[in-house]
């Protein structure tokens, strides 16, 4: 017996084939012998069956002696052996209908759990293989849990059904929503405007919700709430804003924050939350910022750095042109009685630099 | 909803070969047979050929020596290829889906041959 | 080949009117027939599949009949956006054929 694997909703054709290639009376039965669909001179003709009007053959392949049966938007309960009355010879088809779909909405929050579930006919015992975007192989039977998605989870993913060594391929597209960058840092120098940028890692036709940007500074207590904001179809409104900074905020995606200046007091680390409408959860993406300032004071030249910054980061002063430097893996670094010239401070991560400051020292007489 | 997003060259000259692409979303494609249709400008429907996802084909008589057409189930899509083309194959190629009857269908492409 | 065959290859019309084209298949297709709707620049659009039935989200004034060798397709009462090409196809045997087409114009 033939074994035949097909797909909910889908569209399936069952083969049956005369040795003469002609017009010859042919039906087709299922497993209780009613007549789904035949021949009558050159006219289809339908039988009682529940599936005659989702099922059809090709009239064209008849005169080359295949009379298969389609059967259209194929349902778990089309599973059944189906016998196919030809040339005085039975021909049967056992078909096999699976269903896989995702028990939550396709749309998940990163760290949220996607649970994939088998829909099989009685008796059937298929296994079930998934691929994710990102090449992760899952394996299970009548469902699938992926605990905690990630990023890179977002696409299509490619699921197999095996049963009696036959395989039937289900593609589910599942929409990751998070930030493209989980977490990102701005180095600025003291006075210049700061760009904080938050794109999405996906598109929805509509996207609404709100969200907040809460800021720690380096130099305060407590966490404060700098800004927050309304979503609606695309479209960013300021609910809130503090007065000290006056942060300024895009209209349109992707979210877009600007920080009029850097300056020492706002340095320092924000969460940014987005609440998508309907969905339970949140969206967060972490920023921070690094101000530098150079100053000269004296016979002291400073450079310091405020912000979140990696031990392994270094604080260089440097005469332009000449080998004077002065290093630290430190947050301040300092020149007694500089030579007079143009001085550059450097924050550097091995040797690349993240951010520069100039200053120029002027000969005392 | 069922779609075909047909491409392919829209330009040749006499003697070169015709391929379009037509790839289809939103449906089954196995069940089903994918068709290549022509049109000349003023004229009427000329069917060239079909494919089903296993690979059988079926083609137009008159245009069989010269027609090839394949199917990618991967990417849910199937092409035509039409060659030593003469000033009489410039017409609308379209690709549709057939049971038996073409029920879904391209947008078309326009391929003109011209020295 | 199956030739196909319609008739007339236009026909004016004022909106409202009945409006009836024919199609005549040989050798005999029993039922197994269709009729197309294409408009200028546009891919044709099934109406009418097996003689008689309706495609899904085609308007009721549309109707198909016919057995055999003949078969109609009539507009009942023709309405501004019926103005267009009809072609019928057989689905009987390949290769896979079309009638010449039938241009419904305003009167």
């Known amino acids: 017996k033939k074994v035949v694997l097909g797909k909910k909703g889908d569209t399936v054709e069952l083969t049956c084939n005369a040795s003469q290639k002609k017009n010859t009376q042919f039906h087709w039965k299922n497993s209780n012998q009613i007549k789904i669909l035949g021949i009558q001179g050159l006219f289809l003709t339908k039988g009682p069956s529940k599936l005659s009007d989702r099922a059809d053959s090709r009239k064209s392949l008849w005169d080359q002696g295949c009379f298969s049966m389609i059967i259209k938007n194929l349902k778990i309960e089309d599973s059944d052996t189906y016998i196919c009355e030809v040339e005085n010879k039975k021909e049967e088809v056992e078909l096999l209908v699976f269903g896989l779909t995702a028990n939550s909405d396709t749309h998940l929050l990163e760290g949220q759990s996607l649970t994939l579930t088998l829909e099989s006919p009685p008796g059937s015992s298929p296994s079930v293989k998934c691929r994710s975007p990102g090449g992760k192989n899952i394996q299970g039977g009548r469902t699938i849990s992926v605990p905690q998605l990630e990023r890179q989870d977002s696409g299509t993913w490619t699921c197999t059904v095996s049963q009696d060594q036959k395989t039937v391929e289900f593609k589910i597209d599942i929409v990751v929503l998070a930030f493209q960058k989980a977490s990102s840092t701005v180095y600025k120098k003291e006075g210049e405007q700061v760009e904080f940028s938050f794109p999405l890692a996906f598109t929805l036709e509509k996207l609404t919700g709100s969200g907040e940007l809460w800021w720690q500074a380096e130099r305060a207590s407590s966490s404060k709430s700098w800004i927050t904001f309304d979503l609606k179809n695309k479209e960013v409104s300021v609910k809130r804003v503090t007065q000290d900074p006056k942060l300024q905020m895009g209209k349109k995606l992707p979210l877009h924050l600007t920080l009029p200046q850097a300056l020492p007091q706002y340095a320092g680390s924000g969460n940014l939350t987005l609440a998508l409408e309907a969905k339970t959860g949140k969206l967060h993406q972490e920023v921070n910022l690094v101000v530098m300032r150079a100053t000269q004071f004296q016979e002291n030249l400073t450079c310091e750095v405020w912000g979140p910054t990696s031990p392994k980061l270094t604080l260089s002063l440097k005469l332009e042109n000449k080998g004077a430097t002065v290093s630290k893996q430190a947050k301040a670094v300092w020149v007694l009685n500089p030579e007079a010239g143009m001085w550059q401070c450097l924050l550097s991560d091995s040797g690349q630099v993240l951010l520069e400051s100039n200053i120029k020292v002027v000969p005392t007489w | 909803q069922v779609q075909l997003q047909q491409w392919g060259a829209g330009l040749l000259k006499p003697s070169e070969t015709l391929s379009l692409t037509c790839a289809v979303s939103g449906g089954s494609f196995s069940g089903y047979y994918w068709s290549w249709i022509r049109q000349p400008p003023g004229k009427g429907l000329e069917w060239i050929g079909e494919?089903?996802?296993?690979?059988?084909?079926n083609c137009n008589p008159s245009l069989k020596s010269r027609v090839t057409i394949s199917v990618d189930t991967s990417n849910n899509q199937f092409s035509l290829k039409l060659s030593s083309v003469t000033a009489a194959d410039t017409a609308v190629y379209y690709c549709a889906r057939v049971l038996n009857y073409f029920d879904y269908w391209g947008q078309g492409t326009l391929v003109t041959v011209s020295s | 080949d199956i030739q196909m065959t319609q008739s007339p290859s236009s026909v004016s019309a004022s909106v409202g009117d009945r409006v009836t084209i024919t199609c005549r298949a040989s050798?005999?297709?029993?039922?197994?027939l269709a009729w197309y709707q294409q408009k200028p620049g546009k891919a044709p659009e099934l109406l009418i599949y097996a003689a008689s039935s309706l495609q899904s989200g085609v308007p009721s004034r549309f109707s198909g009949s016919g057995s055999g060798t003949d078969f109609t397709l009539t507009i009942s009462s023709l309405q501004p956006e019926d103005f267009a090409t009809y072609f019928c196809q057989q689905a009987n045997s390949f290769p896979l054929t079309f009638g010449g087409g039938t241009k419904v114009e305003s009167k």
């Open positions: 494919i089903n996802h296993s690979g059988s084909t």
């Open positions: 050798p005999d297709i029993a039922n197994w």
